[in-house]
């Protein structure tokens, strides 16, 4: 699997995609997870809905939620009010039994806000009770890594 | 109707090579995983691998792989399993089997109706 | 791998008796569970899926019991069609692991 890099702002929405063959994954719940290192385990972030007829519904743990439109053949992940320490390795993945296929290996890249000349610590972060509902998405940058690639260039 | 079926039977010399196959129809052969079983004489069931004809994605069980050769023709609607050099152990019935995924469970619910390898010399 | 074992090995029973049939796994299988029917000369046929869903066609007197790690076929009343080899198959880890099967007689 090449790795597709999604560019998002701080403090701002991303929505990061995942196509897939509709019938090779039918009835397959998906899930969403964080690769630890570059042989580690992939931690499980959010998985869609245990019914998988149920899979359009949104699902959040935290300030991530997941949606699957298994008809089409799209997962869809947003990552609410980005934050630097949410840049890094992710894969989406198709669920059966104790078995994991991935579906795409992400690089989320996060981005200084070029508006936001405030502290840091005049920084806004939404409150539990807002929904991902009313979140304002921003359409994220996307593009897939060449081979040999490095994902972060050494700084000088 | 739905079905599955295999190519004839095969008598073979070790070292020799061989390709049986998996015919699909009444069925979009594309959307669908396909299964290769064996059956040593007189033993049980072997979960041999699998291949998913639309992008033919390939999985093979540890004991298998590098063994055999599991590939697919979507033109055709038409599955395959291939030995370079076959063994007098490589003597079986195999079958391919269509796996249909549901939110109840998988199920390998339509079988060839299974082609026997004999390997003697 | 996931190890599936099967008991008893052969099981002779009476037409119209009650037949029960086990497969245990080494680790949960969850309810990625199925079980197949085979007579001489001839192909598997899939009674059961996802554990405990019939397959079409397949009659009320087959049913299973059970998930994790150990589930029972019963066949209600034999009838004389069901005289043959039974497999169960998990498919929650790869690579998908077989049962040794059982083959029930006729007593």
């Known amino acids: 699997h090449n790795t597709t890099v999604f560019q998002g702002v701080e403090g701002q929405s991303l929505q990061v995609s995942c196509p897939y063959d509709s019938m090779k994954h039918w009835g397959r719940r998906k899930a969403w997870c964080r690769q630890l290192g570059e042989k580690g385990p992939c931690q499980r972030v959010v998985s869609t809905h245990n019914l998988w007829l149920l899979s359009f519904l949104r699902r959040r743990n935290g300030s991530t939620a997941i949606t699957d439109d298994t008809l089409g053949g799209t997962l869809t992940i947003t990552l609410r009010n980005l934050q630097p320490h949410d840049a890094g390795f992710y894969q989406c993945q198709s669920l059966h039994g104790s078995e994991a296929d991935t579906l795409r290996k992400v690089l989320v890249e996060v981005l200084a806000d070029p508006l936001d000349h405030r502290d840091a610590g005049d920084l806004w972060v939404p409150g539990e009770s807002e929904s991902f509902e009313d979140a304002h998405v921003e359409h994220s940058i996307s593009r897939s890594l060449l081979e040999g690639e490095i994902p972060f260039p050494p700084t000088s | 109707e739905v079905q599955l079926v295999q190519s004839g039977a095969e008598v073979k010399k070790p070292g020799e090579s061989l390709m049986i196959s998996c015919k699909g129809s009444?069925?979009?052969?594309?959307?669908?995983?396909i299964g290769w079983v064996r059956q040593m004489p007189g033993k049980g069931l072997e979960w041999m691998g699998i291949?998913?004809?639309?992008?033919?994605?390939?999985r093979y069980s540890p004991s298998f792989q590098g063994q055999v050769t599991i590939s697919a023709d979507k033109s055709i609607s038409t599955a395959y399993l291939q030995w370079s050099s076959l063994k007098a152990s490589d003597t079986a019935m195999y079958f391919c089997a269509r796996r249909r995924q549901g939110i109840w469970g998988d199920a390998l619910d339509i079988w060839g109706q299974g082609t026997l390898v004999t390997v003697s010399s | 791998e996931i190890v599936m074992t099967q008991s008893p090995a052969t099981l002779s029973v009476s037409p119209g008796e009650r037949a029960t049939l086990s497969c245990r796994a080494s680790q949960s299988v969850s309810s990625n569970l199925a079980w197949f029917q085979q007579k001489p000369g001839q192909a598997p046929r899939l009674l059961i899926y996802g554990a405990s869903t019939r397959a079409t066609g397949i009659p009320a007197r087959f049913s299973v019991s059970g998930s994790g790690t150990e589930f029972t076929l019963t066949i209600s009343s034999l009838q004389s069609e069901d005289f043959a080899f039974y497999y169960c198959l998990q498919d929650n880890n790869w690579p998908p692991t077989f049962g040794p099967g059982t083959k029930v007689d006729i007593k």
């Open positions: 291949i998913y004809p639309g992008d033919s994605d390939t």
């Open positions: 009444g069925y979009s052969f594309t959307n669908y995983w």
